[in-house]
Interface confidence: low
C-alpha cells in the first residue's frame, strides 16, 4: 500500500524530521507549515490546527519561509550619496548602493553602510587601478616621458607628444609644447578614460574628505606612507 | 591591518557635552594627520574637523566652530572630539578616519551620538 500522504500538523515518526517547508512546534510537538515569504506566522500551531499565517505589514518583510511572529523591518531609507537599487516590499529588504562617482567604502550583509567620493588623481598623478563598488580609486605619479594635467578619477598618464622641436618640455603634469605644426604622439591622442565604476571618491588634490555638506576649506592630512591595508596600494 | 575603532557616544540631551575617542592601530599613528566625518540619518557624509599629525593645525566645519574640540594622544594613539553645547542637529554616527596625502582611506565602524530631550 502506498504510503499515507501526512497533513499538517502532524506527529512526526521518532527520530524523525518535518519535510521541506515545515517546522516542529516544541510547543504543540508536531510537525507544523512555515509561512511562504511575504508572510509571518500571525497564530502558532497546535495539535489540532496550522500555523495561521499574515501578510507582511508596510516597510515589513520576510524572505524566506518562516514562522517569525513579526515580520522583519526594512531598512531606513537611502542616503543622499546612495540610490535605492532594491525596493522594500514584503519579501525583499530595500538595498541601497553608492550612487555614480562614490564607492562603498562600509559594506554591510546587502548594500552599502557608508559611500565615500571616489579619489581624484591630481596633475602630475594618473589612475593605477580605476574605484570598484568598494574600492576606492589609487593614483600613481605620472613616470617620466608621460603626464596628466586633470584632476580626474578615471584618467591615466598620457604620454607626451613627439616634437620636432620642442618648445616646452613636458613634465608630468604638462604636455610637451611643440612649435611644429603637426606634432605625432607615440600613443593615440587625447585624455585616456578608464571605464567608470557602477558606484565609486576624490586622491593627490587637496582632500575633499565629504561630499557636497563638506566645509569650504578642505583638511590636508601630512603626506607619508600608506598605513598597511588589504587590497590598497601606495602612490 | 589598519583598525580605528571609536568610542564615547551615546545620548544626550541639548546643551550637554561628549567625548568621543578614536584608536589607532596597525599603522604609526604619529604620522598620521585624523579626522572626524560624520554622518546624520538620511543624510550624507559631513567632515567634521581634522588634526595635523603633529598636532600643530585644527581646522573644524563652520556648523561645530566653537563648540567642538579635536586633540590627540600619540603616546595612545588616540585622538578625541570634546562636542560641548550639542544641538538636535549633531545628531549622526561619528566616524574617525584618516589615511594619506589627504585622503581618507581607513574608517572605524562608527559611534553613534544622538542628541534628544
Known amino acids: 500500500l502506498p504510503a499515507q500522504v501526512a497533513f499538517t500538523p502532524y506527529a512526526p515518526e521518532p527520530g524523525g524530521t518535518c519535510r521541506l517547508r515545515e517546522y516542529y512546534d516544541q510547543t504543540a510537538q508536531m510537525c507544523c507549515s512555515k509561512c511562504p515569504p511575504g508572510q509571518h506566522a500571525k497564530v502558532f500551531c497546535t495539535k489540532t490546527s496550522d500555523t495561521v499565517c499574515d501578510s507582511c505589514e508596510d516597510s515589513t518583510y520576510t524572505q524566506l519561509w518562516n514562522w517569525v511572529p513579526e515580520c522583519l523591518s526594512c531598512g531606513s531609507r537611502c542616503s543622499s550619496d546612495q540610490v535605492e537599487t532594491q525596493a522594500c516590499t514584503r519579501e525583499q529588504n530595500r538595498i541601497c548602493t553608492c550612487r555614480p562617482g562614490w564607492y562603498c567604502a562600509l559594506t554591510k550583509q546587502e548594500g552599502c553602510r557608508l559611500c565615500a567620493p571616489l579619489r581624484k588623481c591630481r596633475p602630475g598623478f594618473g589612475v593605477a587601478r580605476p574605484g570598484t563598488e568598494t574600492s576606492d580609486v589609487v593614483c600613481k605619479p605620472c613616470a617620466p616621458g608621460t603626464f596628466s594635467n586633470t584632476t580626474s578619477s578615471t584618467d591615466i598618464c598620457r604620454p607626451h607628444q613627439i616634437c620636432n622641436v620642442v618648445a616646452v618640455p613636458g613634465n608630468a603634469s604638462m604636455d610637451a609644447v611643440c612649435t611644429s605644426t603637426s606634432p605625432t604622439r607615440s600613443m593615440a591622442p587625447g585624455p585616456v578614460h578608464l571605464p567608470q565604476p557602477v558606484s565609486t571618491r576624490s586622491q593627490h588634490t587637496q582632500p575633499t574628505p565629504a561630499p557636497s555638506t563638506a566645509p569650504g576649506t578642505s583638511f590636508l592630512l601630512p603626506v607619508g606612507p600608506s598605513p598597511p591595508a588589504e587590497g590598497s596600494t601606495g602612490d | 591591518d589598519v583598525q580605528l575603532v571609536e568610542s564615547g557616544g551615546g545620548l544626550v540631551q541639548p546643551g550637554g557635552s561628549l567625548r568621543l575617542s578614536c584608536g589607532g592601530s596597525?599603522?604609526?599613528?604619529?604620522?598620521?594627520?585624523m579626522s572626524w566625518v560624520r554622518q546624520a540619518p538620511g543624510k550624507g557624509l559631513e567632515w567634521v574637523s581634522g588634526?595635523?599629525?603633529?598636532?600643530?593645525?585644527?581646522d573644524y566645519a563652520d556648523s561645530v566652530k566653537g563648540r567642538f574640540t579635536i586633540s590627540r594622544d600619540d603616546a595612545k594613539n588616540t585622538v578625541y572630539l570634546q562636542m560641548n553645547s550639542l544641538k538636535s542637529e549633531d545628531t549622526a554616527l561619528y566616524y574617525c578616519?584618516?589615511?594619506?596625502?589627504?585622503?581618507?582611506?581607513?574608517w572605524g565602524q562608527g559611534t553613534q551620538v544622538t542628541v534628544s530631550s
Open positions: 578616519a584618516t589615511g594619506e596625502d589627504g585622503e581618507l582611506n581607513y
Open positions: 596597525g599603522f604609526t599613528f604619529s604620522s598620521y594627520g
Open positions: 588634526i595635523y599629525d603633529d598636532g600643530s593645525v585644527t
